[in-house]
């Protein structure tokens, strides 16, 4: 979109489930009528229009000019449509990955789930909710990032080597918090600052590793909007 015209942004991790929230304010008198509610989710991809599924033509409508800053916009398409009787239609390649929670729908939650989210899912989403006597909408932009943990130096380590683990997610803003942990038999054990563990933002410095440090290390990045991502790395220290 042109600067100054932006919809709320939802971040998701490539390969992980993503929730596209839609819980519009519904007047109390309409809550009992939610079983008859219909919802249509539309997707306008960020780039490169997805191939049309045979037998599922893209939705009718105008094909308007894009803002001057863009090239031609990829054509929008219906991801999923749920009619008043719960009848569903949508785009075939997506359908196994796309879900609406039926119980949620009856509570007024029309969120779309992508299980898992893929890079091609990025773009603008619009949900149109049809109730008995009113229509409501939700709009958001889905951005997808890749999570990774790197070790420097990479590969297997020897006892008393040093290593720096760097936890990252491809998102422009910095995480609000970073938590490190180790996966042990009894679950996650937090990693705290100590002579053996030096924490600095998204880095963990181990000045002298031992075979005891072998195994899975993890971090959780939490962002200001509440989005969080958990990343694991398997450290190998040779005796």
């Amino acid at each position: 979109l042109q600067p100054g015209a932006e919809v709320p942004v939802v971040w998701a991790q490539e390969g992980a489930p993503a929730q596209l929230p839609c819980s519009p304010t519904i007047p109390l008198q309409d809550l009992s009528l939610l079983r008859r509610a219909g919802v249509t989710w539309q997707h306008q991809p960020d780039s490169g229009p997805p191939a049309a599924a045979p037998g599922h033509p893209l939705a009718p409508g105008p094909h308007p000019a894009a803002p001057s800053s863009w090239g031609p916009r990829p054509r929008r398409y219906t991801v999923l449509s749920v009619g008043p009787g719960g009848l569903r239609s949508g785009r075939l390649p997506l359908q196994p990955r796309v879900q609406l929670d039926e119980r949620g729908r009856q509570r007024g939650d029309f969120s779309l789930w992508l299980r898992p989210a893929r890079r091609a899912d990025a773009g603008e989403y619009r949900a149109a909710v049809h109730l008995r006597d009113r229509a409501l909408s939700c709009r958001l932009r889905l951005r997808l990032g890749q999570a990774s943990m790197t070790a420097s130096p990479p590969g297997s380590l020897r006892a008393s080597d040093w290593v720096i683990l760097n936890c990252s997610f491809s998102r422009p803003d910095r995480p609000a918090s970073v938590h490190w942990f180790r996966n042990r038999g009894q679950g996650r054990v937090p990693v705290r600052e100590s002579p053996h563990h030096h924490l600095a933002e998204s880095f963990l410095f181990l000045p002298q590793v031992s075979p005891m440090d072998s195994g899975p290390w993890g971090c959780i990045l939490t962002y200001r909007d509440g989005f969080n991502v958990s990343i694991m790395y398997n450290l190998t220290v040779l005796g």
């Epitope: 539309q42 009113r134 909408s137």
Partner: antibody, heavy 120, light 107 residues
């Protein structure tokens, strides 16, 4: 080309009835939601009624609810507005409009309008 | 219902001028705002939808911006055919509502 042509406007007494028709051409009428929008003389635009492409959902402005009925006949490529119990404040130019998408409620094609005058 | 308040109600300008019309929604409508142009005795015409997308065939001098509750229609260099009344409309939720209109007159 894409066209909407209204008919059925005229002068009617308060309490009377009138039926507006809208003939659509140049596009696949059955694939589009449709709406009626009105404009009182010298005033702004007011949305009146809406029907989805499949006719599953119909909505009305509070000012006309219970008095006006929107309907469509996809076989005839036609939209209708049945107006009962007309009041002086219903006097307006009534526009038949195409809704861009069932799920994107702006109006991309407009007819030339049908004038409805309610007066004794 | 969502109220749409346009300002100014009228504006005088000359050919070549840059003109800005604003529209304020009574609640958040994300980017669900359209702009229409209406000339006397004619039906309105769609110019902009979803706050910033120009409709097919609309000249590039027309642009829209905004999100949330504040929206703007800008005409970068007025042409003689641009003197008309402009309306904003929220297309977020029913009932779909319009601003009261801004009349653009020749100075």
């Amino acid at each position: 080309q894409v066209q909407l042509v209204e008919s059925g406007g005229g002068l009617v007494k308060p309490g009377g009835s009138l039926r507006l028709s809208c003939a659509a051409s140049g596009f696949t009428f059955s694939s589009y939601a449709m709406s009626w929008i009105r404009q009182a003389p010298g005033k702004g635009l007011e949305w009146v009624a809406y029907v989805t492409s499949g006719g599953d959902y119909i909505y009305y402005a509070d000012t006309v609810k219970g008095r006006f009925t929107i309907s469509r006949d996809d076989a005839k490529n036609s939209l209708y507005l049945q107006m009962n119990s007309l009041r002086a404040e219903d006097t307006a130019m009534y526009y038949c409009t195409r809704v861009a998408y069932d799920y994107e409620w702006y109006f991309d094609v407009w007819g030339q309008g049908a004038l409805v005058t309610v007066s004794s | 219902d969502i109220q749409m308040t346009q300002s100014p109600s009228s504006v005088s300008a000359s050919v070549g001028d840059r003109v800005t019309i604003t529209c304020k929604a009574s609640q958040d409508v994300t980017t669900a705002v359209a702009w229409y142009q209406q000339k006397p005795g004619k039906a309105p015409k769609l110019l902009i939808y979803s706050a910033s997308y120009r409709y097919t065939g609309v000249p590039s001098r027309f642009s829209g911006s905004g999100s949330g509750t504040d929206f703007t229609l800008t005409i970068s260099s007025l042409q003689p055919e641009d003197f008309a009344t402009y309306y904003c409309q929220q297309h977020d939720s029913s009932p779909w509502t319009f601003g009261q209109g801004t009349k653009l007159e020749i100075k």
